[in-house]
């Protein structure tokens, strides 16, 4: 039945069958000899969704994913046998699981896979224009995939390709122990995080990587990595996970005498996403699962949306927290974490911080150091032993904007769309879960824009069998959502206005920013349309005010809906 917009109960709950019957989902159920449709690359210009999977790369039409091209990229029988002899599973491990799929230039993609525990990369030709209809593997040009793709398909990789250079957070060894953030490709020697030092990285699980400008000077550009890792000894009693944001200067070329071919500007900080718990002890959501950057107006200051779960076996829950880049930068300009030895507590470093401040990008702006290779020895020495910041980054409003603790699922993915409505702009979140459902949630500002009320609009099952959602992309051009899992790929529209009913009141009560009552139906709201008779109230969901005007159907009868 109809539900008003309470946080815990969706306005609409649609089963997979109902989604199919109402033409609200298109599913690609995978190939018999493939799986793991986890690596997505959205190309709005070409209207394609590229998907890396087991032994295959797909190019789906954004209009309808039933229309696709595929590249088969398996490993040789010899390589597969070697993998099997090393004691690996022939089906789940001894194949080429695509982990990296990035735009390389106007005509090519760059792809890397696990290569049956022997990482390998190549280029994919996609042509200059969509009408070229080219999608083929450059068979003559294979490259070593170490430091780009992990050996083990179970391991996560975060990557970013900019200006011909690939930044990857991955494991660089066969056993998945040597985790690092690498920069490869390009004309320079590869650069990486310090080896064998748990203060830098401590068994990390990489989530994503993003380029964010600091100023109008491109020399100040930074690459930010989001990951979770084991808390460093002394940082926490017992074994714990911490969510992290790490920074690296794009123009970091390593040190001259120390930290040679290692990052000199790497810093990391903890991301906090917690709620006050009983006994004054906060309940932390530390297992960062996904990150989405909402770029709006100012690309230097995107809003960071993070999806977190709890690591506790007793208490299972998920949350979404929002962070501002100004808060992140403030932490990176704050005190460094320091301790005098393994048995000491971590404290804020109180001593003299060398100049230029470690973590600052070399540029004419600050200090006149043209390259990290010119940095003074004391800066490098300090940077090597102080990679972590003491203060954590707290979320906006100091609390999550979405919390789910009373359900049999956990959040896995998030994408966000900024929607223009009659009464302002709203961020609509699409949250993927580990049981193959997508939650559509709108955040509604209350007194201040960052003090938000969450309304759960829809809960949609997008795969036939419960399967964890592992990838999501949103096309604003097509107004479609694309979802990946082990089983396949699904496509669904961002809005289903007609499903909200045949009455103005129901359309209004839905509080869906995409939808408004147009006098005869609940339909997609376009702010540019000059129709006076558009009833919509996202902020309050009040049909009495909006559905009683002349010319607007004001019936308040509630129809039975999909539940």
């Amino acid at each position: 039945n109809y539900q008003n917009g309470k946080n815990n109960v969706p306005r609409l709950k649609l089963s997979y069958k109902e989604m199919l019957e109402s033409n609200n989902v298109i599913t690609f159920n995978g190939l018999a000899n493939s799986s793991s449709y986890h690596t997505f690359l959205l190309d709005e210009e070409r209207s394609r969704l590229y998907v890396g999977a087991k032994d295959h790369i797909f190019s789906f039409d954004l209009v309808n994913i039933k229309d696709f091209q595929k590249i088969v990229w398996p490993v040789s029988y010899t390589r597969r046998d070697e993998c099997k002899w090393a004691g690996k599973d022939i089906l789940k491990e001894c194949a080429n699981f695509i982990k990296v799929l990035k735009a390389y230039n106007q005509t090519h993609l760059y792809a890397c896979g696990t290569g049956a525990f022997h990482p390998i990369c190549t280029y994919i030709e996609i042509g200059h224009h969509p009408e070229d209809n080219i999608f083929k593997l450059e068979n003559s040009h294979f490259e070593n995939g170490r430091g780009k793709s992990p050996y083990d398909p179970k391991l996560l990789t975060a990557s970013l390709l900019i200006d011909g250079e690939l930044y990857s957070g991955t494991a660089a060894d066969f056993m998945g122990r040597d985790f690092a953030i690498f920069r490869t490709l390009g004309h320079h020697h590869p650069i990486r995080t310090e080896q064998h030092d748990s203060r830098w990285l401590n068994d990390p699980k990489f989530i994503s990587a993003h380029l964010i400008s600091e100023s109008d000077n491109p020399e100040d550009d930074k690459v930010y990595f989001f990951f979770r890792e084991n808390a460093i000894d002394g940082e926490h009693s017992g074994k714990a996970t911490h969510a992290r944001i790490g920074q690296i200067c794009k123009n970091d070329f390593g040190g001259h005498r120390s930290l040679v071919n290692k990052w000199t500007t790497f810093l990391k900080a903890r991301l906090i996403c917690s709620v006050p718990g009983p006994n004054g002890i906060d309940t932390h959501f530390d297992e960062l699962q996904d990150v989405f950057l909402m770029n709006f107006k100012d690309p230097k200051n995107p809003v960071v949306y993070g999806v977190f779960t709890t690591s506790s076996n007793i208490f299972k829950g998920s949350a979404v927290c929002m962070y501002s880049m100004s808060d992140v930068r403030r932490v990176f300009l704050g005190p460094y974490a320091h301790r005098d030895g393994p048995n000491y507590q971590w404290v804020p470093y109180q001593g003299r911080v060398p100049y230029p401040r470690p973590g600052t990008c070399p540029s004419k702006t600050f200090g006149g150091f043209d390259s990290t290779k010119d940095l003074p020895d004391d800066v490098i020495t300090f940077a090597r032993s102080h990679p972590a910041m003491y203060n954590p980054v707290f979320p906006m409003n100091n609390r999550p904007i979405v919390i789910k603790t009373d359900v049999n699922y956990q959040f896995t993915q998030i994408v966000v769309d900024r929607v223009d409505a009659e009464d302002g702009q709203y961020d609509v979140m699409f949250i993927g879960t580990d049981v193959g459902t997508v939650l559509k949630v709108v955040s509604i500002p209350k007194e201040t824009w960052y003090d938000l009320e969450e309304v759960l609009l829809e809960e949609m099952t997008v795969f036939r069998e419960p399967t964890a959602i592992s990838a999501m992309e949103l096309s604003t051009k097509q107004q479609q959502l694309y979802i990946g899992s082990t089983a396949g790929v699904a496509q669904l529209p961002l809005h289903r206005c007609d499903i909200y009913g045949k009455a103005c009141a129901e359309c209004c009560l839905a509080r869906d920013p995409y939808c408004a009552w147009d006098g005869s139906a609940c339909s997609r709201y376009f702010p540019t349309a000059k129709a006076r008779t558009r009833a919509q109230d996202i902020r309050n969901g009040d049909p009495l005010t909006h559905c009683s005007d002349g010319g607007i159907e004001g019936r308040m009868d509630h129809h039975h809906h999909h539940h």
Epitope: E82, A172, D173, F174, Q195
Partner: antibody, heavy 123, light 112 residues
Framework: EVQLLESGGGLVQPGGSLRLSCAAS????????MNWVRQAPGKGLEWVSG????????DYADSVKGRFTISRDNSKNTLYLQMNSLRAEDTAVYYC????????????????WGQGTLVTVSS | QSVLTQPPSVSGAPGQRVTISCTGS?????????VHWYQQLPGTAPKLLIY???NRPSGVPDRFSGSKSGTSASLAITGLQAEDEADYYC???????????FGGGTKLTVLG
């Protein structure tokens, strides 16, 4: 000029102990990972142990695990190998070697070696 | 027993070209780990000859070259000279029990 000078070798009885030292000069000792590699008379090279610049990572070959301890003192530019419960098969020339990590993939290459010190385990 | 396999000996006349092979497995050379080569002249400590499969440290003549393919690597010496007579060792990284592994060594004899 990079120099590594081992000392502390000698004759010791089975079950005995010995402590080897390696004095480093000509480079920033505290920036490099260091290793011990041994060579039994007339035989090939065998990696024994490695230690990172800040002693955060330490590892040993299976053949010496639990008996040998690697350590370093960056203030003295010195690498050590404490060898306990020595056996006849530990007889070898012990070399101190610096990890260069010169290659693209940071797989340890030993770019500088000491001249070695002979350890003989015999009754 | 060494993890990497090298021929015990090779020989060649001055001016000739010789190659030394080094065969590993899918968890060392075959897993993408780099191969390095060392030269040990009689009575001296080993010296790094080739690093990262094919790179020469400064001071090493260009008569020495290295290559790698699949699970094996090789060292080639052209224009053989009497002073090249030495033991040559390959090394790589063992991925399953992570540590450095060496080949058994190859004795190069320069004939005549």
């Amino acid at each position: 000029e990079v120099q590594l000078l081992e000392s502390g070798g000698g004759l010791v009885q089975p079950g005995g102990s010995l402590r080897l030292s390696c004095a480093a000069s000509g480079f920033d000792f505290d920036s490099y990972e260091m290793n011990w590699v041994r060579q039994a008379p007339g035989k090939g090279l065998e990696w024994v142990s490695g230690i990172s610049w800040n002693s955060g990572w330490i590892d040993y070959a299976d053949s010496v695990k639990g008996r040998f301890t690697i350590s370093r003192d960056n203030s003295k530019n010195t690498l050590y190998l404490q060898m306990n419960s020595l056996r006849a098969e530990d007889t070898a020339v012990y070399y101190c070697a610096r990890s260069g990590y010169s290659s693209s993939w940071f797989d340890p290459d030993f770019d500088y070696w000491g001249q070695g010190t002979l350890v003989t385990v015999s009754s | 027993q060494s993890v990497l396999t090298q021929p015990p000996s090779v020989s060649g006349a001055p001016g000739q070209r010789v190659t030394i092979s080094c065969t590993g497995s899918s968890s060392d050379i075959g897993a993408g780990y780099d191969v390095h080569w060392y030269q040990q002249l009689p009575g001296t400590a080993p010296k790094l000859l080739i690093y990262g499969n094919s790179n020469r440290p400064s001071g090493v003549p260009d008569r020495f070259s290295g290559s790698k393919s699949g699970t094996s690597a090789s060292l080639a010496i052209t224009g053989l000279q009497a002073e090249d007579e030495a033991d040559y060792y390959c090394s790589s990284y063992e991925g399953i029990n992570p540590y450095v592994v060496f080949g058994g060594g190859t004795k190069l004899t320069v004939l005549g």
